[in-house]
Interface confidence: low
Amino acid sequence: MSLLSVPHTESVSLSTGSTVTIKGRPLVCFLNEPHLQVDFHTEMKEDSDIAFHFQVYFGNRVVMNSREFKIWKEEVESKNMPFQDGQEFELSILVLEDKYQVMVNGQAYYNFNHRIPVSSVKMVQVWRDISLTKFNVSN
């Protein structure tokens, strides 16, 4: 199976019903504190606003947030850790009318209410300490 380069960035156009699917594996064991970060940007620039920020501190916690005008907003944290040490994962982010529904390995994980209109999302970036085997957007 061929690996995608990380960081991986793609132009996207999201609307209600869209699903972003990411499949990969942590590069190192959880003792070494690998991270996964997924950002939904409003422009094709890394310093642009982020409608949805999803960061996994593998084996520890998951943090979700948004960034507007370069300012991070109220952080949401979950200690629920659905990712398994050394195991491949499938992360799906479903765009619902009022929120993003995050699924991990087919199981509902968290709902994050929209703070920035989904229609403004232009780019998704997946990065940090993972090997990436799949990135797909279905509308």
Epitope: P7, T9, K45, M123
Partner: nanobody, 121 residues
């Protein structure tokens, strides 16, 4: 190892056209996504256009409808056709090759020295 060299820059009046070319050396050219970035004096490097291995492309909002990116895998070249040029398009234009289709400069491993485009009003 891939080497990229840009050409085709120059001085043009507003409303005019230029065609930039990027020649790549290396048999692996077709396995790379390619992009054009530009950098004006005192400003950070800015994404212009990118093209996938198979020819899918995307553009910065500021050039959409005016610029066209294309590639010829047989000739190891990428071109950027620039029409309806504006003074704000003035910059050094850099061609880049990378393993992923991206808008982020650090995703690209190989860079050309750049070709200067100056648009006068």
């Amino acid at each position: 190892e891939l080497q990229v060299v840009e050409s085709g820059g120059g001085l043009v009046q507003a409303g005019g056209s230029l065609r930039l070319s990027c020649a790549a050396s290396g048999r692996t050219f077709s396995t790379y996504s390619m992009a054009w970035f530009r950098q004006a004096p005192g400003k950070e490097r800015e994404f212009v256009a990118a093209i996938t291995r198979s020819g899918g492309n995307t553009y910065a909002d500021s050039v959409k409808g005016r610029f066209t990116i294309s590639r010829d895998n047989a000739k190891n070249t990428v071109t950027l056709q620039m029409n309806s040029l504006k003074p704000e398009d003035t910059a050094a234009y850099h061609c880049a090759a990378g393993g992923t289709y991206s808008f982020v400069p650090r995703s690209y491993n190989y860079w050309g020295q750049g070709t200067q485009v100056t648009v006068s009003s």
